[in-house]
Amino acid sequence: EVEKTACPSGKKAREIDESLIFYKKWELEACVDAALLATQMDRVNAIPFTYEQLDVLKHKLDELYPQGYPESVIQHLGYLFLKMSPEDIRKWNVTSLETLKALLEVNKGHEMSPQVATLIDRFVKGRGQLDKDTLDTLTAFYPGYLCSLSPEELSSVPPSSIWAVRPQDLDTCDPRQLDVLYPKARLAFQNMNGSEYFVKIQSFLGGAPTEDLKALSQQNVSMDLATFMKLRTDAVLPLTVAEVQKLLGPHVEGLKAEERHRPVRDWILRQRQDDLDTLGLGLQGGIPNGYLVLDLSMQEALS
């Protein structure tokens, strides 16, 4: 805390400009009017204040706005935003996408900080849902943003927002998240034709059920192995050898290299060996010829 001292004669700040970087901390405290600072916040970003000086400027704003800063000030915080704590940010009411963009720009190129996470949380809660423009903005700054949300949070994403999602935005999503996103993507892209649809839906397929994979296998999509390896194991297991062959097209040869990894390994164990042999890939581990397969889950459902 800076002691309260009178401003020296002739040093009272009439505007926020570079002359203030020559002020000692106590002079800034004594000579800069908080209301002046609030109205000229946009100038701060161009001026190289030291961290210590920024602490004083923040303190002045905190005194002026103990209940939280108004959006007119927040939008122009510039690099003073880096001085804010999550507790400070929780007092804010940020409704403008322009304000959000301005503050994300300050943090650009860095990992998502607790401050940014709090800001985004406040913004999204204020809007009630993750609309397309917000999602566009957030994934542009933080490609992994979508995958940082819980399945519950993702449920508030409207299908229309899915158009803003790029494949790299889903790189770190786990199956539970894709389970939520896939139906939304399916809905969003439903009016597209076969090949275009597959291009768009491909990165969401880690949440696809068996029946959708069966449908895709009828459309000559030529799914690559990387996509296949990300499919839900429980969705892959019921697929027949013929269906997998159709689904992968020329990429079916890649199964050999992945035969020890899930979901390929588990799928092989469920197929008849003579069916696997028709692929000519030397896949081993299928059910030997002459053995009867009982689907116990089906039997339990019937009893």
């Epitope: 970003n45 161009a46 001026i47 190289p48 690099y79």
Partner: nanobody, 112 residues
Framework: QVQLVESGGGLVEAGDSLRLSCVVS????????MAWFRQAPGKEREAVAS????????IYADFVKGRFTISRDYEKNTIYLSMNNLKPEDTAVYYC?????WGQGTQVTVSS
């Protein structure tokens, strides 16, 4: 992002001169105030001189007036700090800054 790289520091004797350079890359500077700061061991960082890139306005700290000169070269995106009649108390790490961006600093040591 803006990158600032200082150079020109060194060990000199009292009364000697040095010229520090700061090359800026990564973004246009029109909207920035650029400045030289210094930090002596155990002391707070303090502003030495500033130059407003768009208006050309120059400001100096009282303790360097008449001895130090800040200047700029548009074409080279560089600012300079010419330091004459150096004193032992000028010993510090000198930093260049543009808006929120700071360089890593260059050491100036003035022996008596």
């Amino acid at each position: 992002q803006v990158q600032l790289v200082e150079s020109g520091g060194g060990l000199v004797e009292a009364g000697d001169s040095l010229r520090l350079s700061c090359v800026v890359s990564g973004r246009t500077l029109e909207s920035y105030v650029m400045a030289w700061f210094r930090q002596a061991p155990g002391k707070e960082r303090e502003a030495v001189a500033s130059i407003n890139w768009s208006s050309g306005r120059l400001i100096y700290a009282d303790f360097v007036k008449g001895r130090f000169t800040i200047s700029r070269d548009y074409e080279k995106n560089t600012i300079y700090l010419s330091m004459n009649n150096l004193k032992p108390e000028d010993t510090a790490v000198y930093y260049c800054a543009a808006g929120r961006y700071w360089g890593q600093g260059t050491q100036v040591t003035v022996s008596s």
